[in-house]
């Protein structure tokens, strides 16, 4: 029996991660990720590290958090490479096609790896109580860990549709996972919900040459609101639209726009046109590089931090022991899994509705023949 992923999540960068509790050897873990359409996950630094930590901290696996758990990741030291005591990764490296990336912002080693220049060694992520990452630990590749982490990379995802009047939201994403909330979804994800009067609705994330969107979704709201206001993507009444400071914290439903008073929604055409052509007050909180994305009405520009790259595994054709697992993105029957992860947008949104990218780059060039970074 091959268990479904316990948890998974995606970020605006297009990277998705899944955490699996299953006792297996390193090679079997690699093969399981490949069969799902991904690869054993790198956990480099920055956003990638935070995404994986969020998955771990979302809850304990089997055993209820009573013991430390070891998860296979794409970290190893090849046979011809030596242990390097002064390096953050101790001579180990991530199996990835990424040409570079900072390794200084990484977890510590739970135990120092054995000094060697001859034997290939793998490494695992040790999690205290199964939820709190303790750090890296050297482990022989043929031994069995308690689980593994997979990574999937997409060019574009679908931001979550706003519920509006919807209830009982359920996200069914491609590689056997099921959730009640997901900020970004890969193509193939199906969202089902109930509208008022228990009317079922279902939309699917589809990708094409233009980008990704929810087909059969009218506007950005799953179920239209009976009134004029939405707060955090859900239907609201005017009295519930004031924040702690007395500011207007709602946005206007389709067909309405912010009135001249700045705190009520009027029929479109009656009030002042709002920024970006949407009915969103200027008090709307912006998404930043460190905060979760608020309900997306301002544009979000995605710029990935260096080091967030998909793994390109060397496929081993000898796999026979693992039953078929639907690939993420395939048209297959999908089953259950718990999922939660806040998206990191890496963008700051200005009051004008335009976006400034948050970019942590370690590379630069003095040559004038370069991308014009002022272009967007």
């Amino acid at each position: 029996e091959h268990p479904t992923a316990d948890r998974a999540g995606c970020s605006a960068s297009g990277a998705c991660y899944s955490l699996h509790h299953a006792t297996m050897k390193r090679q079997a873990a690699e093969e399981a990720c490949i069969l799902r359409g991904g690869a054993l996950s790198t956990v480099r630094a920055g956003a990638e590290l935070r995404a994986v930590l969020a998955l771990l901290r979302a809850g304990p696996g089997p055993g209820g958090g009573s013991k430390d758990l070891l998860f296979w990741v794409a970290l190893e030291r090849r046979r011809s490479h030596c242990t390097l005591e002064n390096e953050p990764l101790r001579g180990f490296s991530w199996l990835s096609s990424d040409p570079g990336g900072l390794e200084s912002d990484t977890l510590q080693w739970v135990e120092e790896p054995q000094r060697s220049c001859t034997a290939r060694r793998c490494a695992v992520l040790q999690a205290t109580g199964g939820v709190e990452p303790a750090g890296w630990k050297e482990m022989r590749c043929h031994l069995r860990a308690n689980g593994y982490l997979c990574k999937y990379q997409f060019e574009v995802l679908c931001p979550a549709p706003r519920p509006g009047a919807a209830s009982n939201l359920s996200y069914r994403a491609p590689f056997q996972l099921h959730s009640a909330a997901l900020d970004f979804s890969p193509p193939g994800t199906e969202v089902s919900a109930l509208c008022r009067g228990q009317l079922p609705i279902s939309v699917t994330c589809i990708a094409d040459e233009i980008g990704a969107r929810w087909d059969k979704l009218s506007g950005d709201v799953l179920c239209p609101c009976p009134g004029r206001y939405l707060r955090a993507g859900k239907c609201a009444e005017l009295p519930n639209c004031l924040d702690d400071l007395g500011g207007f914290a709602c946005e206007c439903a389709t067909g309405f726009e912010l009135g001249k008073d700045g705190r009520s929604c009027v029929t479109s055409g009656e009030g002042q046109p709002t920024l970006g052509g949407t009915g969103v007050p200027t008090r709307r909180p912006p998404a930043t590089a460190t905060s979760p994305v608020p309900q997306r009405t301002w544009p979000i520009r995605v710029d990935e931090k260096l080091g967030e790259t998909p793994l390109v595994p060397e496929q081993d054709n000898s796999v026979t022991s693992i039953p078929e697992i639907p690939r993420w993105g395939s048209q297959s029957t999908m089953s259950t899994l718990q999922m939660s992860l806040q998206a990191e947008s890496k963008a700051t949104i200005t009051p004008s509705g335009s976006v400034i990218s948050k970019f942590n780059s370690t590379t630069s060039s003095a040559t004038p023949q370069a991308f014009d970074s002022s272009s967007a």
Partner: antibody
């Protein structure tokens, strides 16, 4: 800083070949689709080719005018984009730009857009 | 292929004047992107997906349209807006650009 440095342009005779390169940096190259777009002297922009990322199996697309003559490729390990140009014609004379295909999220949709352009490399096809 | 026809081809505007550039598609397209290019420089993404301003683009710019008819509008012309503007569709291959509208300062 997002950057792309094009090279490989120059003067070539009709029916000749040329290989353009674009060295990208400042972003995770292997997760983005990339394009080549050209601009003939004093003319408008013309899309040439597109190559998608590994997650989309490096799918390639070409303008009809360059099909079977030009080949777009990439080397993710080196963050390099290439355009192999064979059987060149005088009408291929242009500035060639290496362009990143960014992703923008707005509302509940994600959109592709050519968001970063290199400074270009000039190709002249003349006898 | 989808042909994009921009009009006017060349126009001049005085500072403070309202400017509208149109882009007509030979077949219906889902969205339109707009690029700005100044002499001797690379094009810059200016408006994406019909109406969203790229980062750093002044709020006096706006985009609108649907189907086969799209437009870029500058509410009040400024000297720095003098440039050539191109529309682009990506609803179908080949991806196509309009021939451009050269906007000059009067």
């Amino acid at each position: 800083e997002v950057q792309g440095v094009e090279s490989g342009g120059g003067l070539v005779q009709p029916k000749g070949s040329l290989k353009l390169s674009c060295a990208a940096s400042g972003f995770t190259f292997n997760t983005y689709a990339m394009h080549w777009v050209c601009q003939a002297p004093g003319k408008g922009l013309e899309w040439v080719a597109r190559i998608r990322s590994k997650s989309n199996n490096y799918a390639t697309y070409y303008a009809d005018s360059v099909k079977d003559r030009f080949t777009i490729s990439r080397d993710d390990s080196q963050s390099m984009l290439y355009l192999q140009m064979n059987n060149l014609k005088t009408e291929d004379t242009a500035m060639y730009y290496c362009v990143r295909e960014g992703v923008y999220y707005y509302g509940s949709s994600g959109y592709y857009a050519m968001d970063y352009w290199g400074q270009g490399t000039s190709v002249t096809v003349s006898s | 292929e989808i042909v994009l026809t921009q009009s006017p081809a060349i126009m001049s505007a005085s500072p403070g004047e309202k400017v509208t550039i149109t882009c007509s598609a030979s077949s219906s397209v889902s969205y339109m992107h707009w690029f700005q290019q100044k002499p001797g420089t690379s094009p810059k993404l200016w408006i994406y997906s019909t109406s969203n301003l790229a980062s750093g683009v002044p709020a006096r710019f706006s985009g609108s349209g649907s189907g086969t008819s799209y437009s870029l509008t500058i509410s009040r012309m400024e000297a720095e807006d003098a440039a050539t503007y191109y529309c682009q569709q990506r609803s179908s291959y080949p991806l196509t650009f309009g021939a451009g509208t050269k906007l000059e300062l009067k």
